[in-house]
């Protein structure tokens, strides 16, 4: 059930998922200078019942300054198949997540974790693709890529979205600009 | 909890003009565009259109084009409808509605959406008549 | 843009019968299909997301099901509560478009 690649990789966009379906896995990695503790679980995992669903274990890094050592800890090799990382991390509001029947949210941040996060993403996934700054997006469907499994082999759907350099004209049929800025948001950023 | 309010029941002339107002509540403003559709007595549902709340860009309906604005207030966390030069077949339900958009950060200007709408306001009887 | 055909337009049947109501794309619109519930003087409740998926809160007698230009909305048991129109929308393409909905009444 798990998927057996990374999802599409499309030039000047992140992808992210807005939560992670049931059998998930997520390794607990931490960053330079520590280490899982001894007794911890290498992954959280995501389960649930027909109610709710959450993060099962809980990660936690200690320092490895006392094996006189900063190396990063290194995944066990089942753990380094199908890494998926997820990229905009920072651009998520935990508490403001759509609570998706059969999804955990987001786990919150753990002490002295990895600034990348691996995940393993299981079939029926969804992620979301996102233009990086500087560009937008040109779209006619949803920038969404979708974990399927066809004929016993698991595939990520093509999303439908080209990233283009900010002075190229991009905009819907039907959308107008915003006539004021009260955000402070840069008016010359036309639209998507 | 999260709800939306919208404003009253209007009764406008041929040619004026009504403003709709959309006040959300219990979430955060920014992390949600909000689409406007409408329904005309004993009628189906139609789509008028699309704001994101950050930078306030919209998508208008084809249909709709020239006559209907779409704005938002952050401070307020209002959003408003107005359409103009209303005519008797503009008679019908107005109803705002959220969905999340993808990406949650403060400068997100694009309109992908995931979901469904999820939560609507109680809709604002207009009614054109002279 | 993207027409969306439901039918019947209107379904009679009996609490505890089994409902299948259609939606047909006039293209594909992937599986980016919602269905709603309507009753007399509310606003539409989401049922279903992405075809398939219910919707949080939503009952397990609801289902969806279909992809590509095809989608069913199926009512295992209809409940008295159940009795309402029923829309089915796209999220495929721009503009978002509603099919022209299906009634379900009691017989």
């Known amino acids: 059930e798990l998927c057996d690649d990374d999802p599409p990789k499309i030039t000047h966009a992140t992808f992210k998922a807005v939560a992670y379906k049931e059998g998930t896995m997520l390794n607990c990695e931490c960053k330079r200078g520590f280490r899982r503790i001894k007794s911890g679980s290498p992954y959280m995992l995501c389960t649930g019942n027909s109610s709710h669903s959450s993060w099962d274990n809980q990660c936690q890094c200690t320092s490895s300054a006392a094996r006189n050592t900063t190396k990063q800890v290194t995944p066990q090799p089942e753990e380094q198949k199908e890494r998926k990382t997820t990229e905009m991390q920072s651009q998520m509001q935990l508490a403001d997540q759509v609570s998706l029947p059969g999804h955990c949210r987001e786990p919150p941040p753990w002490e002295n974790e990895a600034t990348e996060r691996i995940y393993h993403f299981v079939v029926g996934q969804t992620v979301y693709y996102q233009c990086v700054q500087g560009y937008r997006a040109l779209h006619r469907g949803p920038a969404e890529s979708v974990c399927k499994m066809t004929h016993g082999k698991t595939r990520w759907t093509q999303p439908q979205l080209i990233c283009t350099g900010e002075t190229e004209p991009s905009q819907f049929p039907g959308e107008e600009e915003p006539q004021a800025s009260p955000d402070g948001l840069p008016e010359s950023e036309t639209s998507r | 909890q999260v709800q939306l309010v919208q404003s009253g029941a209007e009764v406008k002339k041929p040619g004026a003009s009504v403003k709709v107002s959309c006040k959300a509540s219990g979430y955060t403003f920014n992390s949600y565009y909000i689409h406007w559709v409408r329904q005309a007595p004993g009628q189906g549902l139609e789509w008028l259109g699309i704001?994101?709340?950050?930078?306030?860009?919209?998508i208008y309906a084809q249909k709709f084009q020239g006559r209907v604005t779409m704005t938002r207030d952050t401070s307020t966390t209002t959003v408003d409808m107005e359409l103009s030069s209303l005519r008797s077949e503009d008679t019908a339900v107005y109803y705002c509605?959220?969905?999340?958009?993808?990406?949650?950060?403060?400068?997100?200007?694009?309109?992908?959406?995931?979901?469904?709408?999820?939560?609507w306001g109680q809709g604002s009887t207009v009614t054109v008549s002279s | 843009e993207i027409v969306l055909t439901q039918s019947p337009a209107t379904l009679s049947l009996s609490p505890g019968e089994r409902a299948t109501l259609s939606c047909r794309a006039s293209q594909s619109v992937s599986s980016y299909l919602a269905w709603y519930q309507q009753k007399p003087g509310q606003a539409p409740r989401l049922l279903i997301y992405d075809a398939s998926n219910r919707a949080t809160g939503i009952p397990a007698r609801f289902s969806g099901s279909g992809s590509g230009t095809d989608f069913t909305l199926t009512i295992s048991s209809l409940e008295p509560e159940d009795f309402a129109v029923y829309y089915c929308q796209q999220r495929s393409n721009w503009p978002p478009t509603f099919g022209q909905g299906t009634k379900v009444e009691i017989k």
């Open positions: 704001i994101n709340p950050t930078g306030g860009r919209t």
């Open positions: 509605a959220r969905v999340p958009g993808y990406c949650k950060d403060t400068s997100c200007q694009d309109f992908y959406y995931y979901y469904g709408m999820d939560v």
